[in-house]
């Protein structure tokens, strides 16, 4: 004969555990039903009556099967530098992530607690390491033969165009200016539509990104905005 199915609440066999989606109530000494996600225990079980569950109140949630007396409060509304990637519902917490152009300077279990604007490399400096969701941009000075004339969190140093006749030599923050109307094209890797090297200056490639020395951010410790690195601007 098949074993009889026990209905909650029931006393478990000695040494056995309660079934899936049940919990052992110490007071009643019975296996009782858990509440489903989006609910909480309004009345705990007794020897003769099962758990009474109720829906989570506005702006609260439970994500798991549970027997908590109150649902958890959803996190605050997302700030202006964030976007809500998951709404607060009865079954899930709100998740805020940083909007484009920002990165997470202080994470939390899910989403971000504190967003900061991505560093912008000023003219003469290019992006050595792009920003990610959780790390800032790393800037580096443009190497000889390359330049960046923008204040940007995405632009790298680009090779100077190489002229038949140079009108104004390039520097770290400005491209070379040619007198010739049709400069030859550069063969520099990654450089699109750039002039051919004909001057005595050697051909330059894009600078190799260097490892960042930016500190890693612990999500346990609040951290103020870091001072801008050399070549960055904080606007």
């Amino acid at each position: 004969l098949p074993a009889q199915v026990a209905f909650t609440p029931y006393a478990p066999e000695p040494g056995s555990t309660c079934r899936l989606r049940e919990y052992y109530d110490q007071t009643a000494q019975m296996c009782c039903s858990k509440c489903s996600p989006g609910q909480h225990a309004k009345v705990f079980c007794t020897k003769t009556s099962d758990t009474v569950c109720d829906s989570c109140e506005d702006s609260t949630y439970t994500q798991l099967w549970n027997w908590v007396p109150e649902c958890l409060s959803c996190g605050s509304r997302c700030s202006s530098d964030q976007v809500e990637t998951q709404a607060c519902t009865r079954e899930q917490n709100r998740i805020c992530t940083c909007r484009p152009g920002w990165y997470c300077a202080l994470s939390k279990q899910e989403g971000c607690r504190l967003c900061a604007p991505l560093r912008k490399c000023r003219p003469g400096f290019g992006v050595a390491r792009p920003g990610t969701e959780t790390s800032d941009v790393v800037c580096k000075p443009c190497a000889p033969g390359t330049f960046s004339n923008t204040t940007s969190s995405t632009d790298i140093c680009r090779p100077h165009q190489i002229c038949n006749v140079v009108a104004i030599p390039g520097n770290a923050s400005m491209d070379a200016v040619c007198t010739s109307t049709s400069p030859t094209r550069s063969m520099a890797p990654g450089a699109v539509h750039l002039p051919q090297p004909v001057s005595t200056r050697s051909q330059h490639t894009q600078p190799t990104p260097e490892p960042s020395t930016a500190p890693s951010t612990s999500f346990l410790l609040p951290m103020g905005p870091s001072p801008p690195a050399e070549g960055s601007t904080g606007d």
């Epitope: 829906s55 506005d58 702006s59 409060s73 959803c74 605050s76 509304r77 709404a87 607060c88 709100r94």
Partner: antibody, heavy 120, light 108 residues
Framework: QVQLVQSGSELKKPGASVKVSCKAS????????MHWVRQAPGQGLEWMGR????????KHDPKFQDKAVLSSDTSVSTAYLQISSLKAEDTAVYYC?????????????WGQGTLVTVSS | DIQMTQSPSSLSASVGDRVTITCTAS???????LHWYQQKPGKAPKLLIY???NLPSGVPSRFSGSGSGTDFTLTISSLQAEDAATYYC?????????FGQGTKVEIK
């Protein structure tokens, strides 16, 4: 755009009942609450109760528990407030207002109000 | 019930003045659950500040809110003629949810 449009003014005799409607448009009725707030002439705002249109669950200020019945019909995106056993002191403007789930009860859109006058 | 007491009940100020309205709760209210509404004569209330200090889009930045626990403040940094209205605080921390009695702001 989001709109809450309420039914027109009502003149009722004491002891009668009245049903005020609030038609919602421009948003999904899911994951919102519809609240009813009353304002007697020259007085402040008084929260009466709230309904979750998706489930029909209601919550009242105990003061209005036996006075006000909240209901909703999601097929026509309309919430209703029925007030029974009207007295002169129920003369007020009745507002519906919505609060999205997760916004901690902030009522971000309000109906234009329905004046209910109770007079013999 | 949580009682919400606003002060002053009414005030008269000149255009450009800084105006402060306080709201005191009879027991602690989580800052997420404290909101302010503005109501002009003959009109429905309008959400002015949500969760103590956040402005909905379209609300001028001269309005600000602060506070925690039982004491909350609404500030108008530079009063404008169109700010003549009654202002209500509202707690959604414990049911029944309650409003303050209102503060009427008039322009001198």
């Amino acid at each position: 755009q989001v709109q809450l449009v309420q039914s027109g003014s009502e003149l009722k005799k004491p002891g009668a009942s009245v049903k005020v409607s609030c038609k919602a448009s421009g948003f999904n009725n899911k994951d919102i609450y519809m609240h009813w707030v009353r304002q007697a002439p020259g007085q402040g705002l008084e929260w009466m109760g709230r309904i979750d249109p998706a489930t029909g669950n209601t919550k009242h200020d105990p003061k209005f528990q036996d006075k006000a019945v909240l209901s909703s019909d999601t097929s026509v995106s309309t919430a209703y407030l029925q007030i029974s056993s009207l007295k002169a002191e129920d003369t007020a403007v009745y507002y519906c207002a919505r609060s999205p789930y997760g916004d901690f009860g902030a009522m971000d859109y309000w109906g234009q109000g329905t004046l209910v006058t109770v007079s013999s | 019930d949580i009682q919400m007491t606003q002060s002053p009940s009414s005030l008269s100020a000149s255009v450009g003045d800084r105006v402060t309205i306080t709201c005191t709760a009879s027991s602690s209210v989580s800052s997420n659950y404290l909101h302010w509404y503005q109501q002009k004569p003959g009109k429905a209330p309008k959400l002015l500040i949500y969760s103590t200090s956040n402005l909905p889009s379209g609300v001028p930045s001269r309005f600000s809110g602060s506070g925690s626990g039982t004491d909350f403040t609404l500030t108008i940094s530079s009063l404008q003629a169109e700010d003549a209205a009654t202002y209500y605080c509202h707690q959604y921390h414990r049911s029944p949810w309650t409003f303050g009695q209102g503060t009427k702001v008039e322009i001198k």
